[in-house]
Structure formats: C-alpha cells, structure tokens
C-alpha cells in the first residue's frame, strides 16, 4: 500500500506542477517570440543599415551626379544597378558623351572627376553601342594613348591592349607624334579609330562601372 | 510575392503554430495530471496498482520538457 | 549574416520547434489514451464512474486538433 497523501498536499503538488508547466510554456513562447522578433526586426535593421549604406554611397556620387537612373537587376528587389541620369548604360557600364572640347589629358581628368575614365572599348558590340550616340562630324577621345611614341598603346584602366580587338581606320595609326586615339567617322569606312596629337581639343567619351546599390 | 516576403509569412505561420501547440501541450499535460489525481482519489486506494502505474507514466512525461 | 539567410535560419528553428512539440504532443496524447484503456481494464468495471469520467476528459482533448 502506498501511504495516502493529504488532499491539500495533492492540491499543492498539482499547483506546483501547473506552475512548472505554464512557466515552461511562457519560456517557450518567449523564446519563440524572441525568434520571431529577431526574424522581423533584424531584417528591418538590416534593411535600414543597407539603406543607410546606400544613401552614403549615393552621397559619394552626389557632387557630380545629382540624380541616378536605376534598374532592378534580376528578381531580387535588393539589387539595383544605376547610372548617372544623363549617362547611357550598356552591360555593366555607364557611358557619357562629353560635348565639351578638351585635350586628351583634360578629357581624362574630366572623366575622372565624375568617377569615370575615358572609354576603354573591349568588344565590337560595345563599340556598336557607343557609336549610336556619336555625331558623324565630330571626333571623340578614347582612353587609349601611346605616351612614349613607340607604338606601345595602352588603355587608361590598364586593360591589356589587344591588337585583335582594335578598330583602327585603314592606315592608322600612322604618326609617332600622334599619341592619343580618337574615334571618328570616315565615309569610306564608317566609324573607326585614328591617332592624333593629344593636345588638340576633342570631344570625348567617359565610361564608368555601373553603381550597384 | 518575393522570396523574402514569403519567408516572413512562413515565419509568422510557424510562430503562431508554435504558440498554439505550446499552449495545447501544457494544457494536456495539466489535464493528465489532474485526471491522475482524480483517479487516485476515486479509487480509494483499492486498486493501487492502477494508480501507481498511471503515476509512473505521468512522472516519465513530466520530465520531458519541450525543446527550447 | 545577410537578411534572407537570417530569415531562413529562424524558419528552421521555428520549424524544428514545431516538429518536436508536435511529436511530444502526439506522444502524450497516445500515452493518455493507453492509460485510459489500462485504467478501464484494471478496474474490471467496478468503478465505472472513474473510467467514464476520465474518458470524458480524454474525449474532449481528443477532438482538439493542433492547427495546421
């Protein structure tokens, strides 16, 4: 025989048991709530910090690019690729046709103060895109020069100069004193490159990587 | 709906499910204990075997806390 | 951790919590049912009141399905 418990002890035991069980329930629910809150609040803070980062990134560009035109990349709402508003975009880059006329050095400086470089043309497709925005009676500096006058052409961004991906007009380059490259239109050959004196003012084309925010 | 939004909706559903199940589990546990006590009182100790056996069952369960 | 990753991790925690609690709840429910049957057999019908009363308690609980 089990010694019989007093009814009040049993009630007390039941009360303690209930307290323990409900305490466990409360703790569990609190933990769940913490999880859920973290799940809701942290992403919000994450979004907030991301927005702050974006804003500071935008502020960097604001001096020269007061407004950006952005497009959503892929399906994720988080990824936007932007170009400064008057610029045009192609693949992962933004392009700007500078109609002001400057020497090659000044043209490069002008691009650099806008966070860009004189254009580096890597493919025929890129050139075909660029020429859509050019005027036939103008010449435009490229980011291509031969500083030593020894026909060691180099791109401003240090991209290796590949003879196989060049679009020189026939007979060009033709003068060791002409150390900078332009793109211009010749009725016989359409658009192509020519070497000219660097100090003669020309229009120019700037290129920069898209701004990802 | 975007992928992140879907994740938050799922979070909410699982959260509510967790709360409801926690409450149900605790309620059942208490009802079982109450039933055991009631059973003990009604039997007047004649069938102590039954009372003890049930008690053991409940004791075993009592120590199984839901994972935190 | 990135925003989506965090959401998925929390999803996983809540999901596991839900599964564990569901299993515990079902186990408790089954044990309660077994205990009721054992209790009924052992009493030989002498104290049918006890059996019936507990049965009622279990019946009530049995119909409370966890929300899906």
């Amino acid at each position: 025989m089990v010694p019989e418990e007093e009814p009040q002890d049993r009630e007390k035991g039941l009360w303690w048991f209930q307290l323990k069980v409900w305490s466990m329930a409360v703790v569990s629910i609190l933990l769940l709530s913490v999880c859920f809150t973290v799940s809701s609040v942290v992403p919000h803070n994450f979004m907030y910090s991301k927005t702050v980062k974006r804003l500071s990134k935008l502020r960097e560009y604001q001096q020269y690019h007061p407004s950006l035109t952005c497009v959503m990349e892929g399906k994720d709402i988080e990824d936007w690729s932007c170009c400064p508003t008057p610029w045009t975009s192609f693949q992962s880059s933004c392009y700007f046709i500078s109609t002001g006329m400057q020497s090659w050095t000044k043209s490069q400086k002008n691009c650099s103060v806008m966070g860009a470089d004189l254009v580096v043309i890597n493919t025929r497709e890129e050139q075909d895109f660029i020429i859509q925005n050019l005027k036939r009676n103008s010449s435009y500096f490229l980011g291509l020069s031969d500083p030593g006058g020894r026909r060691h052409w180099q791109w401003v961004d240090q991209t290796p100069y590949n003879e196989n991906v060049t679009f020189w007009h026939s007979g060009e380059p033709n003068n060791l004193d002409e150390r900078c490259a332009i793109i211009n239109f010749r009725s016989s050959e359409e658009w192509g490159w020519n070497d000219i004196h660097c100090h003669v003012p020309q229009k120019s084309i700037c290129k920069m990587k898209k701004i990802y925010i | 709906l975007g992928e992140p939004q879907l994740c938050y909706i799922l979070d909410a559903i699982l959260f509510l499910y967790g709360i409801v199940l926690t409450l149900l589990y605790c309620r059942l546990k208490i009802q079982v204990r109450k039933a055991a006590i009631t059973s003990y009182e009604k039997s007047d100790g004649v069938y102590t075997g039954l009372s003890t056996r049930n008690q053991e069952t409940y004791e075993t369960l009592k120590h199984e806390k839901p994972p935190q | 951790l990135g925003e989506p990753q965090l959401c998925y991790i929390l999803d996983a925690i809540l999901f596991l919590y839900g599964i564990v609690l569901t299993l515990l709840y079902c186990r408790l429910k089954i044990q309660v049912r077994k205990a009721a049957i054992t209790s009924y057999e052992k009493s030989d019908g002498v104290y049918t009141g006890l059996s019936t009363r507990n049965q009622e308690t279990y019946e009530t609980l049995k119909h409370e399905k966890p929300p899906q």
Partner: antibody, heavy 120, light 107 residues
C-alpha cells in the same frame, strides 16, 4: 623659331566680309597644334574666335558660328579667317595664335596683331 | 562657357612694391589657368601656365597660385618694365575665355 604674321585690309564696310591671312614660318601647320584666331576689342577684352587643327578640323566659337570660317592653304603654310556680315562691333585687333603648347595650357606664340576697323 | 572675373580692373603701384591680381572662374578649371602680360600696341606674352608654372624666360618675381575657381598672380618687387595690362585665361574647356584685364600703372 615659330613666327606668325597677320595680314589683311585694315578697313571693312559694315555688312561686308572681313578676310585675314596668317602666315606661319618655322613650323608646318599640318605637323601639329591648332591654329587660332583671337581678337581684342577696343576696351581690351579678348575673345577666342575659333581654330583650325593640324588635321584640318575646325572649331568655331558659338557666338560667331554662322558668320565665321577658318580655312588653310597647306602649300603656303597659311591659314585664313573669314567673317561675314560685319558690324561696327567687329572692330578689333585680330591675332593669329598657335594653340596646344604646354599640353594645351597656354598660348605661347602670337602674331603681332592687325587692327581691323569696321566703318562706313 | 566658363566666365572669368578679374580684379582689380586697374591698379597703381610703385617700383619695388608687391602686387597681387586675382581671377575667379565661374566653375572649377582644375588649375588650367594662364596669365599674360601685354604692353601697349603689342601682343600678349605668356607669363604663367597651369596656374603656377612660369613660362620660358619669365623672371622669378612673378608667381602664380590658386586652385579650383580662385587664382592669383603675384609680382614681387615691381620693376619699371612690369607696368602694362595683365590677363588671365582658363584652358579647361573650349572656348577658352579671358578675364577682363587689369591695368597696372606706375603710381
């Protein structure tokens, strides 16, 4: 040493055309640089009018765009200024100047200038 | 076009004095500024280019300074041959515009 010399009529009637010649010695105008016309009004204000580059391309100041033409004769190593429909406002001393020195940082070579008066 | 504002329009000074002429651009010209001296009936002569580099044969008493939109030409210990007109001209972007000039006279 490079030398530039302007020449042309000193008096032009309103509505007529002003034509000036710049003769360059000591450097071929097809070898490099760009060759400017700059004028100085009676109040001393200076204005760049336009240029012809060593490769024959032109630039004209937008304020003169419809009236100005700069051409060259490579065989004579000369370049020319033509300004149509002149008014008394075009009275000035006209200089021919070589551009592009010091990586296009300053005009180092100027002609001595020729005064053109527009008057009836 | 970038506008160049030169001051003062005229200046009287004595031999041996130091004078400063200033030039303000309507936009950043990135140090692409030249200074010229012009004597009566002559063509302008380049003194300074790229804001601070002296042209060939220019005496060291001339010095240029400044950045962005504000530039100045300083003449230490004025000599009699320094009197005349002075002009600034920016070389940042075509058209290259000139300042209005400063007439430096003997006091």
């Amino acid at each position: 040493d490079v030398q530039l010399q302007e020449s042309g009529p000193g008096l032009v009637k309103p509505s007529q055309s002003l034509s000036l010649t710049c003769s360059v010695t000591g450097y071929s105008i097809t070898s490099g640089y760009y060759w400017n016309w700059i004028r100085q009004f009676p109040g001393n204000k200076l204005e760049c009018m336009g240029y012809i580059s060593y490769d024959g391309s032109n630039y004209y100041n937008p304020s003169l765009k419809n009236r100005i033409s700069i051409t060259r004769d490579t065989s004579k190593n000369q370049f020319f200024l033509s300004l149509n429909s002149v008014t008394t406002e075009d009275t000035a001393t006209y200089f021919c100047v070589r551009g592009g020195d010091y990586d296009d940082g300053g005009f180092a070579y100027w002609g001595q200038g020729t005064l053109v008066t527009v008057s009836a | 076009d970038i506008q160049m504002t030169q001051s003062p329009a005229s200046l009287s000074a004595s031999v041996g004095e130091t004078v400063t002429i200033t030039c303000r651009a309507s936009g950043n010209i990135h140090n692409y500024l030249a200074w010229y001296q012009q004597k009566q009936g002559k063509s302008p002569q380049l003194l300074v280019y790229n804001a601070k580099t002296l042209a060939d044969g220019v005496p060291s008493r001339f010095s240029g300074s400044g950045s962005e939109t504000q530039y100045s030409l300083k003449i230490n210990s004025l000599q009699p041959e320094d009197f005349g007109n002075y002009f600034c001209q920016h070389f940042w972007i075509i058209p290259y515009t000139f300042g209005g000039g400063t007439k430096l006279e003997i006091k």
